[in-house]
């Protein structure tokens, strides 16, 4: 590890540093004593009693854990803020859609709509429940809606008849037959279902993916420090104090080996890149072929088209219905329950939609949100790979980059750290000279699996499939309702990895009231990022 160039005899510097930290000076001798009692530091002359050594071991762990958590606070904040923004957006888009449908239908259908508004409200409740809660029953919600709509609309086409409950039951049964031969609303139910389900599945998967990421990262940053790591951290930042040289900073290579060894089995590195790619791919689809905005906007239009189809094909539809369900009784003129006036029933059931594209109250649109997501995620791609560099950039952990040629603490004394820095995977960490690296523990493996599951759900949603549903929807891969969107300029392109470059330093959290702890003050010691962006 290099040689000690200068022997220190006094413990004055150590007493001063530890005294300022609140250590009892009674435990620290004024000059070096024999170190045979030491368990971690070299058993040479020392300023540490056994008790002081144990306390320093705990301090080293607290320092390291604090640095890891502070470095990751930006990451947690990024995912939390994106989750909040997308979730607010999707929920608000559903509300806007419900409101604009109410306006459109009130304007176009008047009393006809207001009398039956409950079924439209129930449709939106079902869509909201699907997005926010269960992730189930979307097909049922839509099928129920169209059945109820037919139940209300069909009698309006025939105000001269009275329709008993068993007739209406037969009517709804007809619409749900497997052969789909009746199709009173034409292709509108299928098209609406396809557009809505794709968009809602994608929106749910994205928001859940962001939430899973945030939770997994929060847990991963709070990992317990294992014994081998605890001892290595003590050798790194505690033992200089015991040696009487607290101002001698640990060698950078020494710190990097300790940090890599402590973190390699704890991070999310194998899954992290794929997870970010999943988020970006899905976000791209949500503003393109699975557009949530278009889907939300189109609900009213598709329903209106369905009603138009029913009206235009009423003769054919009615003939089939009467053939299957029997002819209802004519209404007695005396007992006529105020039907919709003939002119309301016979006027065109066409709703004229405004062309204006909606934005939320905050003026947000999906385009902007996806742009922001890309910008933010580009900052966190190299987080786990760069975490050791980030940790060792703190002034408590290692000598500054500018001091690299100066002697430093090697783990046994003052000198040059000669061991190679071992970066990379868990397998490569087997050659780490500073600690024996364990394989990932059960909680870490579980976190990685959570991340992998979220990634799989997002990638499936980007293909129009819902992994929460047992059997994949055979319609899911069909083309959307004619949206003009170039999926990618070249087949199979995925919005993934920008050109390789060293990881960035962690970011201070943004001040938008998410209550995440700020990063440590020393957040900007990263090696200069190479910006020769290969093409």
């Amino acid at each position: 590890h290099g040689s000690e160039a200068k022997v220190v005899r006094s413990c004055a510097e150590t007493r001063q540093v530890l005294g300022a930290r609140g250590y009892s000076l009674n435990l620290i001798p004024p000059s070096l004593i024999s170190g045979e009692h030491l368990q971690v530091c070299p058993q040479e002359y020392t300023c540490c009693s056994s008790e002081t050594e144990q306390k320093l071991i705990r301090d080293a762990e607290v320092t390291f854990r604090g640095l890891v958590e502070d470095s990751g606070s930006f990451l947690i904040h990024t995912l939390a803020a994106r989750h909040r923004k997308f979730n607010e957006f999707f929920r608000e888009m559903l509300s806007i859609s419900q409101h604009s449908l109410a306006q459109l239908f009130s304007h176009s259908y008047g009393r006809l709509y207001s009398q039956h508004a409950v079924i439209f409200n129930s449709l939106f409740s079902g869509l909201r429940d699907y997005y926010e809660k269960s992730g189930e029953g979307l097909d049922d919600t839509l099928a129920d809606f169209w059945a109820q709509l037919l139940e209300r609309a069909f009698p309006l086409l025939h105000p001269q008849y009275s329709f008993p409950p068993d007739f209406l039951l037969c009517l709804t049964r007809l619409t749900s037959t497997a052969d789909g031969s009746l199709q009173p609303f034409g292709d509108s139910p299928r098209r609406l279902r396809l557009q809505i389900s794709r968009a809602l599945v994608a929106a749910r998967a994205l928001v859940q993916g962001l939430e899973t990421g945030r939770n997994v990262v929060s847990e991963a940053l709070k990992v317990p420090v294992l014994e081998g790591c605890r001892q290595a951290l003590m050798r790194l930042i505690g033992c200089p104090l015991c040696r009487g040289v607290p101002s001698l900073m640990p060698c950078r290579g020494f710190c990097l080996n300790v940090a890599h060894g402590c973190l390699s089995s704890r991070g999310l590195e194998p899954e992290w890149g794929g997870y970010l790619d999943g988020l970006l791919l899905l976000a791209e689809k949500l503003q393109g072929p699975f557009s949530f905005e278009l889907a939300a906007e189109s609900i009213g239009v598709k329903i209106s088209e369905g009603l138009m189809h029913l009206q235009e094909n009423s003769v054919k539809v009615s003939a089939k219905v009467f053939q299957e369900c029997g002819t209802p009784h004519p209404v007695q003129s005396r007992s006529r329950r105020a039907p919709a006036p003939r002119e309301e029933a016979s006027r065109s059931w066409r709703a004229s939609a405004e062309e204006e594209r909606p934005t939320t109250a905050a003026g947000t649109n999906l385009h902007r949100l996806v742009w922001e997501l890309r910008e933010r995620l580009s900052r966190v791609r190299g987080f786990w790979a760069g975490l050791p560099v980030t940790v060792c950039g703190d002034s408590r952990m290692a000598a500054d980059l500018s001091q690299e040629t100066a002697p430093c603490w090697t783990g046994v004394g003052r000198g040059r750290y000669m061991s190679p820095v071992v970066v990379g995977s868990l397998n490569e960490q087997l050659h780490n000279p500073e600690l024996d690296t364990s394989s990932p523990d059960v909680p870490t493996r579980r976190r990685r699996l959570h991340l992998r599951a979220a990634t799989a759900r997002m990638k499936a949603a980007a293909l129009g499939q819902d992994l929460d549903m047992h059997d994949a929807d055979e319609d899911a891969s069909g083309s959307g309702g004619g949206q003009q969107y170039a999926d990618d300029w070249k087949a199979g392109a995925v919005p993934v990895v920008p050109p390789a470059r060293p990881p960035r330093p962690p970011r201070p959290p943004r001040r938008d009231g998410l209550g995440v702890r700020g990063g440590s003050g020393s957040a900007r010691y990263n090696q200069g990022r190479s910006r020769n962006l290969g093409s």
Epitope: G288, W371, E375, L377, Y485, D487, P495, V497, P498, R531
Partner: antibody, heavy 119, light 107 residues
Framework: QLQLQESGPGLVKPSETLSLTCTVS??????????WSWIRQPPGKGLEWIGS???????YYNPSLKSRVTISVDTSKNQFSLKLSSVTAADTAVYYC???????????WGQGTLVTVSS | DIQMTQSPSSLSASIGDRVTITCQAS??????LNWYQQKPGKAPKLLIY???NLETGVPSRFSGSGSGTDFTFTISSLQPEDVATYYC?????????FGQGTKLEIK
């Protein structure tokens, strides 16, 4: 090394459409995660971002110009282009094309081309 | 839109002087800020990215600092070739916006 080169007419009449092309050499325009952007600078004034097109086809425009701007890509020619309709003298500027990666600066830039709007 | 206000709009300094330019954002932009140098008749050149990181190949006399809304660009010892206009640029939010520029001259 990636290089960008703007081309197009140096003089456009008022109310007409300004059309510029940026040719990318030394790299593929369809590489993932790139934004291809247009920025302009009126004589003696500051820089104004016009808009960008992401490799997936999503376009982002400055709201102040949005109603008049179209940015598109021709992968077969490794080019992207700018169209600005209904131009006035206020659109006289040096027009630059540039590349951006998400979360990064504009780099590299083309050398710029002066477009004058005058009858 | 996020407004970027640079000050001063022009300044004159002597060779060897320490020069400071400030840039203020109308809202918190974290450190989503870059600094460019533009010489007459040339395209802008990137000097500092992410508020404080020196671009590869840029002399170390250039530096940047700040986060949130207030940012500073510094030339520690002015050289004759530093005569140019300097721009800050935010990319925290759309639309991307630039400061109005600071024209630097030699006394």
């Amino acid at each position: 090394q990636l290089q960008l080169q703007e081309s197009g007419p140096g003089l456009v009449k008022p109310s007409e459409t300004l059309s510029l092309t940026c040719t990318v050499s030394g790299g593929s325009i369809s590489s993932s995660s790139y934004y291809w952007s247009w920025i302009r600078q009126p004589p003696g004034k500051g820089l104004e971002w016009i808009g960008s097109i992401y490799y997936s086809g999503s376009t982002y425009y400055n709201p102040s110009l949005k109603s008049r701007v179209t940015i598109s890509v021709d992968t077969s020619k490794n080019q992207f282009s700018l169209k600005l309709s209904s131009v006035t003298a206020a659109d006289t500027a040096v027009y630059y094309c540039a590349r951006r990666v998400s979360g990064h600066p504009f780099d590299p830039w083309g050398q710029g081309t002066l477009v004058t709007v005058s009858s | 839109d996020i407004q970027m206000t640079q000050s001063p709009s022009s300044l004159s300094a002597s060779i060897g002087d320490r020069v400071t330019i400030t840039c203020q954002a109308s809202q918190d932009i974290s450190d989503y800020l870059n600094w460019y140098q533009q010489k007459p008749g040339k395209a802008p050149k990137l000097l500092i990215y992410d508020a404080s990181n020196l671009e590869t190949g840029v002399p170390s006399r250039f530096s940047g600092s700040g986060s949130g809304t207030d940012f500073t660009f510094t030339i520690s010892s002015l050289q004759p070739e530093d005569v140019a206009t300097y721009y800050c640029q935010q990319y925290d939010n759309l639309p991307i916006t630039f400061g109005q520029g600071t024209k630097l001259e030699i006394k």
